[in-house]
C-alpha cells in the first residue's frame, strides 16, 4: 500500500485554488484528515489549519487501485494578506500516521500580481506487502 500527499494550485479568473490531494487505497481513507496550514512551520494541525477535510471510505468505489481525495481552499481575490508559506498535511491519529507536504509560498508583488512557488511532487509513505492495509 502507499499513502501520499501532493500540493497544487489552479487559477480561475481572479480566483486561486490551493489544492491538497491525498492518494490512497479505498480502505486507507477512514480515520484520515487532510488540512491546509498557513505560516505554521512547526505546529500545523487540523486545529490551526485554514481548512480541513475528513476522509471517508466510499462504499461505491470498487477495486483496490489508488484513489485520490482532495481538499480545495479557494481565495476569491489574492491580496497582500494572502502572502505567506502554506503546507498541505494529513493525519490519522487512529494509526499514528502524519504526512507533511512540501512548503509552498504565495508572494504578492508591488505590481498587484502574485506568484506561487515551491510546488513539488508527492511526499509519500510506502507500505510493504507484509504489513497489510490500513483499516
Amino acid at each position: 500500500g502507499c499513502i501520499n500527499i501532493t500540493s497544487s494550485a489552479s487559477q480561475e479568473g481572479t480566483r486561486l485554488n490551493l489544492i491538497c490531494t491525498v492518494w490512497h487505497k479505498k480502505e486507507e481513507a477512514e480515520g484520515f484528515v487532510v488540512f491546509l496550514c498557513k505560516d505554521r512551520s512547526g505546529d500545523c494541525s487540523p486545529e490551526t489549519s485554514l481548512k480541513q477535510l475528513r476522509l471517508k471510505r466510499d462504499p461505491g468505489i470498487d477495486g483496490v487501485g489508488e484513489i485520490s481525495s482532495q481538499l480545495m481552499f479557494t481565495i476569491s481575490q489574492v491580496t497582500p494578506l494572502h502572502s505567506g508559506t502554506y503546507q498541505c498535511c494529513a493525519r490519522s491519529q487512529k494509526s499514528g500516521i502524519r504526512l507533511q507536504g512540501h512548503f509552498f509560498s504565495i508572494l504578492f508583488t508591488e505590481t498587484g500580481n502574485y506568484t506561487v512557488t515551491g510546488l513539488k511532487q508527492r511526499q509519500h509513505l510506502e507500505f510493504s506487502h507484509n504489513e497489510g492495509t490500513l483499516s
Partner: antibody, heavy 112, light 106 residues
C-alpha cells in the same frame, strides 16, 4: 501480526528516571506512530505522548517538562524516559500503535 | 484541555439487554471520539473511532453516535463477554479519556 510489548523496571525510586522500551513487530515504525498511555491502579487512562511515523513528537502538556519519547527504527523500538518520578507515577504503562493496537502494559511502582 | 464526563459510572444489565453509555465533552469534540472496552488485567480494546466507525473485527452489536459535545455507545444485545469497563476518548485536541463506565451483570 501486529504486536507491541513494553519492558522496563518494575520498581523505581522516587526522584529517579523511568526508562521503558516498546518493542514492536508486524509493522514498521516509519509507517505508523506510537502512543504512550498510562493507567494508575484502579483508575482511568492518561495519554502521555506520541511519536509519529515521521519521528515528530507530541506530549501531554502536564508531563512535557519531564518526558522524552524517542525511537530506534532499525530495532523496531520506541523509548519513553520520564524523570523526577513520584509515587503518583505508579501505573501500568502501555504503548499502542496509534489508537488501535495496544501492548499488554508494563507495571511500574514508584517507591523507596 | 477537553474534559470528558461518562455516565453512568456503574451500569447493571442482563444478557440480551440493549444498553446505552454516555460521554459528554466540556467543549466541541468535532466527532473525534472513540470508545474502548477494557477487561480486568487486559489492555484496552478499540471498539469505535470517529464517533461511529466500527473498528475491524468488532461485532456489529456495538455502535456509536453523537455530535458536538454529546456522544453515546450502544450495545444492541448484551453478550456475556461484554461485561467490562468502557472508556471514551476524545482525539480532537490531544487525547483525553473519560473516567469510565463499569458494565456489570445484574
Amino acid at each position: 501480526q501486529v504486536q507491541l510489548k513494553e519492558s522496563g523496571p518494575g520498581l523505581v525510586q522516587p526522584s529517579e528516571t523511568l526508562s521503558l522500551t516498546c518493542t514492536v513487530s508486524g509493522f514498521s515504525l516509519t509507517n505508523y506512530g506510537i502512543n504512550w498511555f498510562r493507567q494508575p491502579p484502579g483508575k482511568g487512562l492518561e495519554w502521555m505522548g506520541t511519536i509519529w511515523n515521521d519521528g515528530g513528537t507530541d506530549y501531554n502538556s502536564a508531563l512535557k517538562s519531564r518526558l522524552t519519547i524517542s525511537r530506534d527504527t532499525s530495532k523496531s523500538q520506541v523509548f519513553l524516559k520520564m524523570n523526577s518520578l513520584q509515587t503518583e507515577d505508579t501505573a501500568i504503562y502501555f504503548c499502542a500503535r496509534g489508537m488501535e493496537a495496544w501492548g499488554q502494559g508494563a507495571s511500574v511502582t514508584v517507591s523507596s | 484541555d477537553i474534559q470528558l464526563t461518562q455516565s453512568p459510572s456503574l451500569l447493571s444489565a442482563s444478557v440480551g439487554d440493549r444498553v446505552t453509555l454516555s460521554c459528554k465533552g466540556s467543549q466541541n469534540i468535532n466527532n473525534y471520539l472513540a470508545w474502548y472496552q477494557q477487561k480486568l488485567g487486559e489492555a484496552p480494546k478499540l471498539l469505535i473511532y470517529n464517533t461511529n466507525s466500527l473498528q475491524t473485527g468488532i461485532p456489529s452489536r456495538f455502535s456509536g453516535s453523537g455530535s458536538g459535545t454529546d456522544y453515546t455507545l450502544t450495545i444492541s444485545s448484551l453478550q456475556p463477554e461484554d461485561f467490562a469497563t468502557y472508556f471514551c476518548l476524545q482525539h480532537n485536541s490531544g487525547y483525553t479519556f473519560g473516567a469510565g463506565t463499569k458494565l456489570e451483570i445484574k
